[in-house]
C-alpha cells in the first residue's frame, strides 16, 4: 500500500500521527479491538507533548490507553518499551488494587481526570483513544 498523507475523517492530526477520540465507553479489550479494526491501536504515549495533546482532547474523563499488564509486565500495545519509556502515573500508582470486589487486580491503564495515569479493572466501560501513524503504509489497495 501507499503511505497515508492525511488523517481519516473525524480523526485529529498531531505530529504525524492521527488520533480518534471516542465519546462512548467500552471495556479495554473491546476498545483495543475497535482500534485494531480501524488499522490503528490504543494510544501509546511517548512524550510530554503527546500527553498534553491527548489530555487536552479528552478532558477530565477516565479514558483507556494502550498500556496493560495482563500477562505480567507492563506493555505498550505497539511494542514501545515500557521500562525506558514515558511514564505519568498518579502517586502510589499502579497498585494492582484487589479491593474493588470485581475479582482480580487492575491490569489496564487509563488517563484520570487530571491526565495522570491509573491502573484499573479492564472491564470498566471507559472512553478510549485510537492512534495510527501517518507515515505507516495504509492497508487500502492502490487505486488502479
Amino acid at each position: 500500500g501507499s503511505e497515508r498523507t492525511c488523517c481519516p475523517v473525524n480523526w485529529v492530526e498531531h505530529e504525524r500521527s492521527c488520533y480518534w477520540f471516542s465519546r462512548s465507553g467500552k471495556a479495554w479489550a473491546d476498545a483495543d479491538n475497535y482500534c485494531r479494526l480501524e488499522d490503528a491501536h490504543l494510544v501509546v504515549v511517548t512524550s510530554w507533548e503527546e500527553q498534553k495533546f491527548v489530555q487536552h482532547h479528552i478532558g477530565p474523563v477516565n479514558t483507556w490507553m494502550g498500556l496493560h499488564d495482563q500477562n505480567g509486565p507492563w506493555k505498550w500495545v505497539d511494542g514501545t518499551d515500557y521500562e525506558t519509556g514515558f511514564k505519568n502515573w498518579r502517586p502510589e500508582q499502579p497498585d494492582d488494587w484487589y479491593g474493588h470486589g470485581l475479582g482480580g487486580g487492575e491490569d489496564c491503564a487509563h488517563f484520570t481526570d487530571d491526565g495522570r495515569w491509573n491502573d484499573d479493572v479492564c472491564q470498566r466501560p471507559y472512553r478510549w483513544v485510537c492512534e495510527t501513524e501517518l507515515d505507516k503504509a495504509s492497508q487500502e489497495p492502490p487505486l488502479l
Epitope: 504525524r16 512524550s47 510530554w48 507533548e49 514515558f86 511514564k87 505519568n88 487530571d114 491526565g115 495522570r116
Partner: antibody, heavy 117, light 107 residues
Framework: EVQLVESGGGLVQPGGSLRLSCAAS????????MTWVRQAPGKGLDWVSY????????YYADSVKGRFSISRDNAKNSLYLQMNSLRDEDTALYYC??????????WGQGTLVTVSS | DIQMTQSPSSLSASVGDRVTITCRAS??????LAWFQQKPGKAPKSLIY???SLQNGVPSRFSGSGSGTDFTLTISSLQPEDFATYYC?????????FGGGTKVEIK
C-alpha cells in the same frame, strides 16, 4: 548513547549575527522535538526556543522574538539557531536539548556566545 | 509568564542527610514540572519529569512530588556526588520558565 554537540559560538559585536548548530547522534533525531536554552555567566537557566519534530510548531522567548530563528534539518540530524541583532544581554552559554519526557531530557555541553564591543 | 520560586536559594547539608527543596509556581501548572541537577562547568542533567517520574538512570534516592502550584524535590540520603545546584522548571505553558536554583553545599 545520546549525544548533542553545539558549535558556532564566539565573540561578536552588538548588532551582529551568529548561527549556532547542534549535531545530534545516538537517537532518531526526526522523532524528537528540540529546544535551545541559555545560561549567562554565573546565572540561572533561561529557555530560548522550541521546535517540534516536524517543524510545524515553533515557540520563542519574548526576549529573542523577532531576532532569533530556530530551524532543523532532519536529514542532517541537525538543529540550528540563527541569532541576529545580538545584544550584550545575549551573552551566555547556549545549550541544545532533546525534548521527550520533558522539554530538556538530554543536554549538550554548550557553546559560548559573547556579545561585546 | 509563570514565575517559579525555589526555596531555599542555598543550603548546607552533610552526607546521609535528607534534603528537601521546594518550588512554587505563580499559577497552577498541573503536574508539568521537571527538576534538574547542575554541577559547576557541566550541563544540567534531568532528574524528574511530570513532577514525580524518575528519569532513566537516576538513583531512587531522588523523588519528586506535588501538583498545581507546590512541588518538592527530596534526596532521601545525600551522597557526595549530590552536591550541586538544583533547578525546577515548568512546562505547562509557554514561555517555559525555570526557578532560580538551589545550591546544595557541604556542611
Amino acid at each position: 548513547e545520546v549525544q548533542l554537540v553545539e558549535s558556532g559560538g564566539g565573540l561578536v559585536q552588538p548588532g551582529g549575527s551568529l548561527r549556532l548548530s547542534c549535531a545530534a547522534s545516538g537517537f532518531t533525531f526526526s522523532t524528537y522535538s528540540m529546544t535551545w536554552v541559555r545560561q549567562a555567566p554565573g546565572k540561572g537557566l533561561d529557555w530560548v526556543s522550541y521546535i517540534s519534530r516536524s517543524s510545524s510548531t515553533i515557540y520563542y522567548a519574548d526576549s529573542v522574538k523577532g531576532r532569533f530563528s530556530i530551524s532543523r534539518d532532519n536529514a542532517k540530524n541537525s538543529l540550528y539557531l540563527q541569532m541576529n541583532s545580538l545584544r550584550d544581554e545575549d551573552t551566555a552559554l547556549y545549550y541544545c536539548a532533546r525534548s521527550a519526557f520533558s522539554p530538556f531530557d538530554y543536554w549538550g555541553q554548550g557553546t559560548l556566545v559573547t556579545v561585546s564591543s | 509568564d509563570i514565575q517559579m520560586t525555589q526555596s531555599p536559594s542555598s543550603l548546607s547539608a552533610s552526607v546521609g542527610d535528607r534534603v528537601t527543596i521546594t518550588c512554587r509556581a505563580s499559577q497552577g501548572i498541573s503536574h508539568y514540572l521537571a527538576w534538574f541537577q547542575q554541577k559547576p562547568g557541566k550541563a544540567p542533567k534531568s532528574l524528574i519529569y511530570v513532577a514525580s517520574s524518575l528519569q532513566n538512570g537516576v538513583p531512587s534516592r531522588f523523588s519528586g512530588s506535588g501538583s498545581g502550584t507546590d512541588f518538592t524535590l527530596t534526596i532521601s540520603s545525600l551522597q557526595p556526588e549530590d552536591f550541586a545546584t538544583y533547578y525546577c522548571q515548568q512546562y505547562n505553558n509557554y514561555p517555559l520558565t525555570f526557578g532560580g536554583g538551589t545550591k546544595v553545599e557541604i556542611k
